[in-house]
C-alpha cells in the first residue's frame, strides 16, 4: 500500500461573510487507521475546527458520510461564515492511539472572508460655522474585508480633494475599518448642499454605500439688518421697519429698543423660506412723535442662532416731523450692519438716509 | 478513550426476546458503526449485525435476519440488538463493538451481556 | 458468503519461538488495494482485541512481535516470538462483503 497523503487541493478558498464554506480534504490510503482533525493555524496554539472522533461542533458538518466503507473524503463545511473565521485550516490525519498520534498534515487552505462594509455614517462639526471658514466631515465604516477599499467625498456631486483616510488596523485582522476626515469651505450658497462619503468595496459589486451630510446642520448665515422708515401717518405715528434678511438657521430674536429701553422682543418663528434656504423676516415698529420732545433712537437689536446681538440704529427726528410731512425726509440711519464675513450682495452696509 | 458498556446478564425461557445494549462514551457516537458478535460457550465467534447510528443503517448476516433487531438513541449514545424467538442454541455472550475505521472491523468491543436461554 | 477457513485448529510453541497461523479464504478477499483481513487475539473470559488490520498494519498499542501477511485467499499472522502473554485464541475476519470470522486458532505454550 503506497504511503498516506493529506490532499487539501485548494491553497485558499474566499466566502461571503453569512454563507458556507467547503474545505476539500482527502487522503489517499485508509492506513493507517485513526481520525481525522480539522485545525485552524498550525503550532501549538492551533484551535480545533473538528473531530472526526468527538467533540460537538455546530457549525460543522462533515461533507462525505465518515461512516461509508472506504470513505476517504474528510472534507468539512461550515456554515454562517463570518470574518472571525478567517485564517488557514489543516486537514490533519491521526493514528488511532491513547491518545491518538499525529501522522501527517494537508498543506493547508486560507479562508479569507469577504465581509461587507457597513453603511458609512458622517458626522459634521458639532458647532456652526460661517461662510469662507473651513469645516470637518468625518466618515466611518466598519467590518469590511479584504481591506482594499476606496473612499470617495463628493459636495453636491462635485467630487472632494482635501480628505484624509485611514484603514485599521494596518496589519492582517478578521475585519477592517476605515476613517476619513474631509475638509469643506463653506459658501453662503451652502445651506441646501450636502455631502456625501462613497464607499466602494469588493463585496458591493460595483455598487457602492453612501452616507450623507448636510450642510444645514454645519453653517449658520448671519442676517444683513436695514432698518428704514416708512411713509408718516396722518396721527403723528412713524412707522420703523427693521428688515432682517439672508439669515440661517431661524432660530433668531429681534428687539427693539427706545432710546435704549427694550420696547419689544419678538422671536422668529414658522418663516417662509428662501430658494437658498435661508430665512428673511421684518418687524414694524410704530413710534408716537408726538410723544417725545427729543429725537427717538430707535434700536434694532437682533441675537442670531446664540451669537452676540447685531445692532442697526435710527434716528427719529422729532423736530422734523410736523404732521403733513412725508417719510424718510428727516431720518438718519446711524447704524451699522455689523456681519462676519464680506459678501458682494452686501453693498448697503453703510447706507445714509 | 472509547468505552462501550454493556448491560447485565439476562436469563430468558425459549420463546421470549431479549433486547441487550451497549453504551457508547468517549468518541461522538454518530460517526462510527456498530457491530454486534456472539460467543457461544467454547465456541468461536459469530458476526451478527452492524448499524450505522447516523441514519440507522443496517446490515444483518442471513442467520439472524428474521430473528435480530438494532436500533440506537442517539441521545443517549446507546445501540440495543433485540433477539426475538430465542432458543436454546441462543445461550452465549453477546458483545458490541465499534466500528473506529469504517473498513468493517471491530475496534473496540465492549466486555460482553452472557444471555442464557433456559427452559 | 466467503468462509474463512484457519489452519491450524491448534498450536503448540515454545517460549520465544516463532508462532505461525493461516487464513485463507474461499475466494479473493482484495478489493480497491486493500486485503481485507483483520486478526483478533482473545484472552479467556475477555472481549477480542483487534491485532492487524488490512492484512499487514499493526493496531495501535501491539507489540511489533506480530506481524501479517498474504494476498487475495492466503494470509498469515506470525508471531516472532512467543511470550507467554500471547497465549490466547486467534481469530480472521474478512470484510470483502459482511463480515465473517474464522473459527479461530488456539495457541498453547509448548
Known amino acids: 500500500e503506497e504511503e498516506l497523503q493529506v490532499i487539501q487541493p485548494e491553497k485558499s478558498v474566499s466566502v461571503a461573510a453569512g454563507d458556507s464554506a467547503t474545505l476539500n480534504c482527502t487522503v489517499t490510503s485508509l492506513i493507517p487507521v485513526g481520525p481525522i482533525q480539522w485545525f485552524r493555524g498550525a503550532g501549538p496554539g492551533r484551535e480545533l475546527i473538528y473531530h472526526q472522533k468527538e467533540g460537538h461542533f455546530p457549525r460543522v458538518t462533515s461533507v462525505s458520510e465518515s461512516t461509508k466503507r472506504n470513505n476517504m473524503d474528510f472534507s468539512i463545511h461550515i456554515s454562517n461564515i463570518t470574518p472571525a473565521d478567517a485564517g488557514t485550516y489543516y486537514c490533519v490525519k491521526f493514528r488511532k492511539g491513547s491518545p491518538d498520534v499525529e501522522v501527517k498534515s494537508g498543506a493547508g487552505t486560507e479562508l479569507s472572508v469577504r465581509a461587507k462594509p457597513s453603511a458609512p455614517v458622517v458626522s459634521g462639526p458639532a458647532v456652526r460655522a460661517t461662510a469662507e471658514h473651513t469645516v470637518s466631515f468625518t466618515c466611518e465604516s466598519h467590518g469590511f474585508s479584504p481591506r482594499d477599499i476606496t473612499l470617495k467625498w463628493f459636495k453636491n456631486g462635485n467630487e472632494l480633494s482635501d480628505f484624509q483616510t485611514n484603514v485599521d488596523p494596518a496589519g492582517k485582522s478578521v475585519s477592517y475599518s476605515i476613517r476619513s476626515t474631509a475638509r469643506v469651505v463653506l459658501t453662503r450658497r451652502d445651506v441646501h448642499s450636502q455631502v456625501i462619503c462613497e464607499v466602494a468595496h469588493v463585496t458591493l459589486q460595483g455598487d457602492p454605500l453612501r452616507g450623507t451630510a448636510n450642510l444645514s446642520e454645519a453653517i449658520r448665515v448671519p442676517p444683513f439688518l436695514e432698518v428704514t422708515q416708512q411713509s408718516m401717518r396722518a396721527d403723528n405715528q412713524v412707522n420703523v421697519t427693521c428688515q432682517v434678511t439672508k439669515f440661517y438657521p431661524q432660530r433668531l430674536q429681534l428687539t427693539w429698543l427706545e432710546n435704549g429701553n427694550v420696547s419689544r422682543t419678538e422671536m422668529a418663528s414658522a418663516l417662509p423660506e428662501n430658494k437658498d434656504g435661508t430665512y428673511n423676516w421684518t418687524s414694524w415698529l410704530l413710534v408716537n412723535v408726538s410723544a417725545h420732545r427729543d429725537d427717538v433712537k430707535l434700536t434694532c437689536q437682533v441675537e442670531h442662532d446664540g451669537q452676540p446681538a447685531v445692532n442697526k440704529s435710527f434716528s427719529v427726528k422729532v423736530s422734523a416731523h410736523p404732521k403733513e410731512q412725508g417719510s424718510n425726509t428727516a431720518a438718519e440711519n446711524t447704524g451699522t450692519n455689523e456681519r462676519d464675513y464680506k459678501d458682494d450682495d452686501d453693498k448697503h452696509h453703510h447706507h445714509h438716509h | 478513550q472509547v468505552q462501550l458498556v454493556q448491560s447485565g446478564a439476562e436469563v430468558k425461557k425459549p420463546g421470549a426476546s431479549v433486547k441487550v445494549s451497549c453504551k457508547a462514551s468517549g468518541y461522538t457516537f454518530t460517526n462510527y458503526w456498530i457491530n454486534w458478535v456472539r460467543q457461544a460457550p467454547g465456541q468461536g465467534l459469530e458476526w451478527i449485525a452492524m448499524?450505522?447510528?447516523?441514519?440507522?443503517?443496517?446490515h444483518y448476516n442471513q442467520i439472524f435476519k428474521d430473528r435480530a433487531t438494532l436500533t440506537t438513541d442517539t441521545s443517549t449514545s446507546t445501540a440495543y440488538m433485540e433477539l426475538r424467538s430465542l432458543r436454546s442454541d441462543d445461550t452465549a455472550v453477546y458483545y458490541c463493538?465499534?466500528?473506529?475505521?469504517?473498513?468493517?472491523?471491530?475496534?473496540?468491543w465492549g466486555r460482553g451481556t452472557l444471555v442464557t436461554v433456559s427452559s | 458468503d466467503i468462509v474463512l477457513t484457519q489452519s491450524p485448529d491448534s498450536l503448540a510453541v515454545s517460549l520465544g519461538e516463532r508462532a505461525t497461523i493461516n487464513c485463507r479464504a474461499s475466494?479473493?478477499?482484495?478489493?480497491?488495494?486493500?486485503?481485507?483481513i483483520f486478526w483478533y487475539q482473545q484472552k479467556p473470559g475477555q472481549p477480542p482485541k483487534l491485532l492487524i488490520y488490512?492484512?499487514?498494519n499493526r493496531d495501535s498499542g501491539v507489540p511489533d512481535r506480530f506481524s501479517g501477511s498474504g494476498s487475495g485467499t492466503d494470509f498469515t499472522l506470525t508471531i516472532s516470538s512467543l511470550q507467554a502473554e500471547d497465549v490466547a485464541v486467534y481469530y480472521c475476519?474478512?470484510?470483502?462483503?459482511?463480515?465473517?470470522f474464522g473459527q479461530g486458532t488456539k495457541l498453547e505454550i509448548k
Open positions: 488490512l492484512a499487514s
Open positions: 463493538a465499534m466500528d473506529y475505521g469504517s473498513l468493517y472491523a471491530m475496534d473496540y
Open positions: 475476519q474478512h470484510s470483502r462483503e459482511l463480515p465473517t
Open positions: 448499524i450505522d447510528p447516523s441514519d440507522s443503517e443496517t
Open positions: 475466494q479473493s478477499v482484495r478489493s480497491s488495494g486493500y486485503n481485507w
